[in-house]
């Protein structure tokens, strides 16, 4: 038994002092708008559907349902004595999905269609989500909405990022087969895009692949082989989506940077960090040219985003994912250097422009501190004994350092007697020497090692 | 794993013929030309000729023209050398061997070779 | 045809040594590639494009030159690096040195 203090309907009058469920009406097996209370709240009886009239006499709203009364003002019980008649409308407005696949206006829908579905022996529809089917949940104050910036600036940018793929000839056959792939990001409407040199070494045949699945032959515009930075483009009737670069120069270590990439097609890859170091010491990882400077980030770079773009939160490039040298210690060629790229090759095509030469020996390179030492002696058990110098990350194939037997994982410690405490060391002689001769630790054991630097292009 | 698997030794007579297999798993057959090398007792590797899997196209040593024939089936994975007119001197191992090809340098090798199977050509 | 001239034919030398096998051709090549092949076995690809290291091959192993003349080294031999070397070459179809057969000491 319900006392009045129990009930949920407002007191009516001509009401009982106690509920007795034995004097109830006996109800329907099925009722259009579900189950209600009566305006004692006493007995369950059908509730009035969506639309329906309700207040006066003709009894309560459906579950889920509310009386309204014109204006929207809902009803009550100084309403209903005013005798005003109102109709039933559903509490909640915001259409949902069902589990039968079909989206409903609202809450009170879906259940109406329960309530048939159940008549009928099939199963209840129930609520999949919120939002229409094939919708996400568009809710703006949930925390999913208010806190998934990584995703907020991924869906932003993936648009333009590319999937690139590269094609080799068999020997004899002459016959193409795909051989390697890697990602780039448009920079122009009008097709323009950019990746690593390394992605579409050895004039490769190039595909470009864009996110909706369009495929296009690309035409390698310009290489900077030394910066690490080339420039295509494909031929693409209407305006593509576009990345804006950032400045890299404005990075400030423990900044959020996304790394996304399209490793595989009509898939983007997505990694994510913060910057480590910015700009490594102008020349610190002199890589290939004497003003190389590299971000540094523990966002995951590998062969499928290494091409593409390292964004920052407002979605600007600033930097070219370009390669990972161990666990958790990744670096990206800074946009500002992509941008002086750019402005050089512009000019190149535009006036064939003479370049003034650098010396160049073929090396990627870090300065050795105690620190990275030690943390590169716990990961490889063989690396040198040694706490200062300049450590090779990666020797470029056909240069000069490649001819001379340098190795990756080779410590210069000195060069033409000096001896060598940092990368910018190795920089500076470079610049001044004709000869470099190098001693360099392998292992546990000093070579002597002559290379000649070339003169190239800048 | 790449395997590249050859059968067994044979003995022939001068003048007969001879077919060896190699089953090929590990990767996409038809990615990759298939190459046949020689090796007689004491001397140099000596290349024989390649097969692209996919077309059939077939590329020849003009040492061997005439005499060698290299097939491939795709659904199978194999590929086929075939030598006629055996003579004393073929008497050799012969190695299937997969084309490599260097990415950074555009070079090509032989990256994967099969155990080799040994010809006996003897009256 | 690209004629190749493989130096030593054969030599001898203790564990530890600095072992050097050069290798001519008679018309400049882009790369070469050097092979190890132990009795009874197929041949295993060591340097691939002249200097790069093929996958699992120890460091002691490296690879030089340029145009027609080219080198081969082992830092410091071990016992199971007895075997004969080849030099290949791939200009327009492959060719190989006649080896260099290198023993212990």
């Known amino acids: 038994q319900l006392s009045r203090a129990g009930r949920s309907a407002p007191l009516a009058a001509g009401c009982p002092d106690r509920c007795e469920p034995a004097r109830c009406p006996p109800q329907p097996e099925h009722c259009e708008g579900g189950r209600a209370r009566d305006a004692c709240g006493c007995c369950e009886v059908c509730g009035a559907p969506e639309g329906a009239a309700c207040g006066l006499q003709e009894g309560p709203c459906g579950e889920g349902l509310q009386c309204v009364v014109p204006f929207g003002v809902p009803a009550s019980a100084t309403v209903r004595r005013r005798a005003q008649a109102g109709l039933c409308v559903c509490a909640s407005s915001e259409p949902v999905c069902g589990s039968d696949a079909n989206t409903y206006a609202n809450l009170c829908q879906l259940r109406a269609a329960s309530r048939r579905s159940e008549r009928l022996h099939r199963p209840p529809v129930i609520v999949l989500q919120r939002g229409a089917c094939g919708q996400g949940q568009e809710d703006p104050n949930s925390l999913r909405h208010k806190y998934n910036f990584i995703a907020d600036v991924v869906e932003k940018i993936a648009p333009a990022v590319v999937h690139i793929e590269l094609f080799r000839k068999l020997p004899f056959s002459k016959r193409e087969v795909p051989v390697a792939s890697g990602s780039g990001f448009i920079v122009s409407e009008d097709g323009l895009i950019v990746t690593n040199a390394h992605v579409v070494t050895n004039k490769h045949r190039v595909k470009v692949e864009l996110k909706n699945g369009a495929t296009y032959e690309a035409k390698i515009k310009d290489v900077d082989e030394k910066a690490d930075i080339a420039l295509i483009k494909i031929d693409h009737q209407g305006k593509l989506p576009v990345l804006l670069l950032g400045r890299s120069s404005e990075l400030r270590p423990g900044e959020f940077v996304v790394a996304i990439g399209s490793p595989f097609s009509l898939q983007n890859t997505v990694t994510t960090g913060i910057v480590s170091t910015t700009q490594r010491g102008g020349k610190e990882l002199g890589l290939r040219n004497s003003d190389m400077d590299y971000i540094q980030t523990d966002a995951i770079i590998n062969y499928g985003n290494s091409g593409g773009p390292l964004v920052n939160l407002d979605g600007e490039v600033i930097g070219i994912n370009t390669l990972k040298v161990t666990a958790g210690i990744s670096f990206a060629i800074p946009s500002d250097k992509i941008k002086k790229f750019l402005t050089e090759s512009h000019d190149r095509q535009a006036k064939g422009k003479a370049i003034t030469k650098k010396k160049y020996i073929g090396i990627r390179m870090m300065s050795l501190t105690s620190s990275k030492a030690k943390e590169l002696k716990d990961r490889h058990r063989d690396f040198p004994d040694v706490i200062s110098g300049a450590y090779i990350i990666e020797v470029i194939p056909d240069t000069p350092a490649e001819a001379g037997g340098l190795k990756e994982n080779d410590v210069i410690i000195s060069i033409n007697g000096q001896s060598v405490v940092s990368a910018n060391d190795v920089s500076d002689v470079i610049k001044r020497e004709s000869t470099l001769n190098m001693v360099v630790r392998r292992g546990n054991e000093d070579i002597m090692i002559t290379v000649i630097p070339e003169e190239i292009d800048p | 794993q790449v395997q590249l698997v050859q059968s067994g030794a044979e003995v022939k007579k001068p003048g007969a013929s001879v077919k060896v297999s190699c089953k090929a798993s590990g990767y996409t057959f038809t990615d990759y030309e298939m190459h046949w090398v020689r090796q007689a007792p004491g001397q140099r590797l000596e290349w024989m000729g390649a097969i692209d899997p996919e077309t059939g196209g077939t590329a020849y040593n003009q040492k061997f023209k005439g005499r060698v024939t290299i097939t491939a089936d795709k659904s199978a994975s194999t590929a086929y050398m075939e030598l006629s007119s055996l003579r004393s001197e073929d008497t050799a191992v012969y190695y299937c061997t997969r084309e490599g090809y260097s990415y950074e340098g555009g070079g090509y090798y032989f990256d994967y070779w099969g155990q080799g199977t040994l010809v006996t050509v003897s009256s | 045809d690209i004629q190749m001239t493989q130096s030593p034919s054969s030599l001898s030398a203790s564990v530890g040594d600095r072992v050097t096998i050069t290798c001519s051709v008679s018309?400049?090549?882009?790369?070469m590639y050097w092979y190890q092949q132990k009795p009874g076995k197929a041949p295993k690809l060591l340097i691939y494009d002249t200097s790069n290291l093929a996958s699992g091959v120890p460091s002691r192993f490296s690879g030089s030159g340029s145009g027609t003349d080219f080198t081969f080294t082992i830092s410091s031999l071990q016992p199971e690096d007895i075997a004969t070397y080849y030099c290949q070459q791939w200009s327009y179809y492959p060719t190989f040195g006649q080896g260099t057969k290198l023993e212990i000491k």
């Open positions: 018309s400049s090549v882009s790369y």
